[in-house]
């Protein structure tokens, strides 16, 4: 091989050993009988050499560096050539390096022809082995802008004070052009500007300078995104670290088309904008770091460009034509507002009228679609009223409290489905019978299902909450005196899978005077926890509640109260509890405002627990928690 470098070309060629391999035999550069492992050729030199092995590409790499000085004379702008031509070089992995030095006031722009560049992170490699490593300069410090492959969106990179561009070509790659040109620009007054062009749908992952190490202190870096107007862009931060700031705050700023508050300032920990139409800029601003403990600022983010979300092209039919007295509202979940700008998240009726809230009413079919970067930002609340006006017609009539499948198929999470159950006053009462026995939610035995039923009085003047109930317990039915609301509340997206476990039937039954009666059929396996309604606020004044507790013939039930005293202090009347054996009618009466609560008691037959409140003084409410446990009978007492 012969390499001759013209004088004044400012080119240096270096041939050196590449990555260590486990090859059995080393290879050398042979130059006038000397065996060496590194050869440097400078401008004006001509050197003839050979290799001592057949496959030098397995051992050596070649670096061709051209220094371009824009300080002392005019800059050679325009398309950059590969010099010396790749055909004149040995077939080794080649790295062409262009080191451009310029004044601080001069902006330099690298322009990449098609294909554009795609940034890669640490540990990643390019499929074709062709990589572009770009770095800039702040005074004497080298700053890595990034490493890039072909076939991406990065079209231009603007810097000032100098740029170092390294193009790595594998030994077998036929490429013989640099693929970029250099242009001069006015000062950009920041570390760099990276332009990313989207022709259509796609995504780009980009990183702050020096990633994964720290972004230079108090610097500014901007990404300009060119996005067709008919597409939408969303930004998400994949990874970031904040440094310890002494002055100023690390932040990102967006110039978003159509925003009246440009620039929009975000913290790195904020949810970033989505659903942006057209071009926008994103800038990362560092701070003055604490000298003792600077920490590092770094950011890796993704820009996703797509047609207005896939969901917006999907039409969902919500058929409420057979429903009566029902309304469905799709609305944003409540979130803490930590900033001014919130990316659009809309629900559209007939794909035309879009708003952040939409209420659909019964009696017709509705076609809806979504225009939203993240549908988990929305939820659904449904209300349905089942009322009886004529007690003769309603008595013994049953209704199934089931979420319609149309609603379950929507891509938005159901939050609450509330049934308002209304009965004629003093004429009828209600009974709720679940498909699966229910467990009452208590601190001692919390519900861990994806949904619960919240049962509360629906009489405006009455503050009575019976409790939260979920499938998988011992409560067979709940009877209530008058109007109630039953709310199915979901707690996890897995409700979709567990929807089959829902199922509650409401029946209108003859009127009774007690506020509520719980029928409990405990399982032998577990302890049943029960608590009085309105837990934490106390059973309302003069309210009476009962539990009908079944005990199988071969079992004995242990009734345990979790306090020594009820704690209630009566202003008027008496608070009492009656425990009555159903078979013998034998009963024990306890004065809750005076007596201690009973010690654990054993019941061989089904029994009632009835609790009736007085009018308590404020702050001395009636709250009771008790449990029932079944164990096999050891002696037959019948």
């Amino acid at each position: 091989f012969e390499i001759a470098l013209p004088r004044e070309s400012n080119i240096t060629v270096l041939i050196k050993l590449g990555t260590p391999t486990l090859l059995a035999k080393p290879c050398y550069i042979v130059i006038s009988k000397r065996h060496i492992t590194m050869l440097s050729i400078k401008s004006g030199e001509r050197i003839v050499f050979t290799f001592s092995c057949q496959s030098p590409e397995n051992h050596f790499v070649i670096e061709i560096q051209k220094n371009i000085d824009c300080m002392s004379g005019p800059c050679p702008f325009g398309e950059v050539q590969l010099q010396p031509s790749t055909s004149l070089l040995p077939t080794l992995n080649r790295t062409f390096i262009w080191d451009v030095k310029a004044h601080k006031s001069i902006g330099l722009e690298l322009q990449f022809s098609i294909p554009r560049l795609r940034q890669i992170g640490p540990g990643e490699s390019c499929p074709d082995g062709v990589t572009h490593s770009i770095s800039g300069r702040i005074d004497a410090t080298v700053v890595r802008i990034g490493t890039f492959c072909s076939n991406g969106t990065v079209s231009r990179i603007k810097m000032q004070e100098g740029v170092k561009m390294a193009l790595h070509l594998p030994w077998f790659h036929p490429r013989n052009v640099s693929g970029f040109s250099i242009a001069n620009r006015s000062s950009i007054k920041r570390l760099c500007i990276i332009e990313s062009v989207f022709e259509g749908e796609g995504s780009a992952t980009l990183m702050s300078a020096n990633y994964p190490e720290g972004f230079p202190e108090d610097e500014l870096m901007t990404w300009q995104f060119v996005v067709p107007a008919h597409l939408r862009a969303s930004v998400s931060f994949l990874n970031f670290n904040l440094s310890n700031c002494e002055r100023k705050e690390e932040r990102v700023e967006y110039y978003i088309p159509g925003s009246t508050t440009n620039p929009e300032v975000f913290k790195l920990e904020d949810k970033q904008p989505g659903n942006m139409a057209g071009n926008f800029n994103l800038s990362l601003q560092g701070c003055d770091q604490d000298a003792q403990s600077p920490g590092i600022l770094r950011l890796q983010f993704q820009v996703l460009v797509q047609h207005p979300q896939n969901e917006s092209n999907k039409i969902y039919v919500v058929d409420l034509s057979n429903e009566r007295a029902m309304s469905l509202t799709i609305e944003p979940r409540p979130v803490k507002q930590s900033r001014k700008f919130v990316p659009g998240c809309f629900v559209c009726l007939e794909s035309r009228t879009c708003s952040s809230n939409l209420t659909l009413t019964s009696g017709s079919k509705h076609k809806i679609s979504f225009l939203c970067d993240d549908l988990t930002r929305l939820w659904m609340n449904v209300e349905k009223t089942i009322s009886c006006t004529d007690h003769r017609y309603c008595q013994r009539k049953s209704y199934s409290l089931q979420v319609p499948s149309d609603i379950l198929h929507l891509p938005v999470e159901l939050h609450d489905f509330s049934w308002k159950l209304l009965v004629p006053k003093d004429r009828l009462s209600l009974v709720l019978v679940p498909a699966q026995k229910l467990q009452q939610h208590t601190h001692e035995k919390p519900c861990n299902t994806s949904f619960s039923y919240l049962v509360a009085s629906a009489i405006p003047s009455q503050d009575l909450y019976f409790g939260s109930f979920c499938p998988g317990g011992s409560i067979k039915q709940i009877q209530v005196k008058q109007n109630i609301s039953v709310t199915l509340r979901t707690f996890a997206p897995s409700f979709q899978q567990e929807a089959s476990r829902q199922g509650l039937t409401v029946s209108f039954i003859p009127y009774f005077k007690e506020e509520g009666v719980f029928t409990v059929t405990p399982d032998t396996k577990s302890k049943v926890y029960l608590r009085t309604p309105n837990w934490d606020r106390g059973l309302p004044s003069l309210t009476s509640v009962s539990w009908n507790i079944s005990v199988p013939r071969d079992q004995v039930a242990c009734l345990t109260f979790f306090k020594e005293r009820s704690g209630v202090v009566c202003q008027t009347g008496r608070a009492f509890m009656i425990i009555q054996e159903q078979r013998t009618r034998a009963e024990e009466i306890f004065s809750l405002d005076e007596d201690v609560l009973p010690k654990p008691s054993f019941h061989h037959h089904s029994f009632w627990v009835n609790i009736s409140n007085c009018s308590p003084t404020s702050g001395k409410q009636l709250d009771l928690l008790f449990s029932v446990t079944l164990t096999p009978r050891t002696v037959d007492l019948t």
Partner: antibody, heavy 116, light 108 residues
Amino acid sequence: EVQLVESGGGLVQPGGSLRLSCAASGFNISSYYMHWVRQAPGKGLEWVASIYPYSGYTYYADSVKGRFTISADTSKNTAYLQMNSLRAEDTAVYYCARAYYAMDYWGQGTLVTVSS
Amino acid sequence: DIQMTQSPSSLSASVGDRVTITCRASQSVSSAVAWYQQKPGKAPKLLIYSASSLYSGVPSRFSGSRSGTDFTLTISSLQPEDFATYYCQQSYYVYPITFGQGTKVEIK
């Protein structure tokens, strides 16, 4: 597995001689540069001599030129350092090293003490 | 002869610190500089060759760079096992081969 084992060190009087051996295994020394590097007690590293057995080329530090001779026996896969006219300042741990990606493998070292 | 002037001769640092050691060649040695780590009573170990190439098996927190005749070894986040003495060496087949004086990295 590449290994280098030095031997032949010891106590010798000024003006005396010693021959150090460096037995190599796991590679063929004829294809590599072999070096001797020494380190006086509490001091830094000092290159002593090199040989490229394939061509027989040898190189020496000025401080040992004419007194030390580096050689290699490719059949035994061993490099040698013959040290004559030893001086007190030659007291050091002598390491032999193989060079390709710089000095990529080193022996454990052998101590040479020159003292009367 | 090519002199390799290494600085500092010693430094104190804590685990997690970024440590930089520099070597200046008295004349051009291209990229033919290697860096070694040596612990007391042990032989040196190769860390970096050709100024910036990481030798196999060496943790990536070690890196080397070159600017003209100035060479730098950087340990990005010092670990307990990194407390040792570090040497630079020019190896551009320009004899004699020369080492820097060494930099002792001690625990602060």
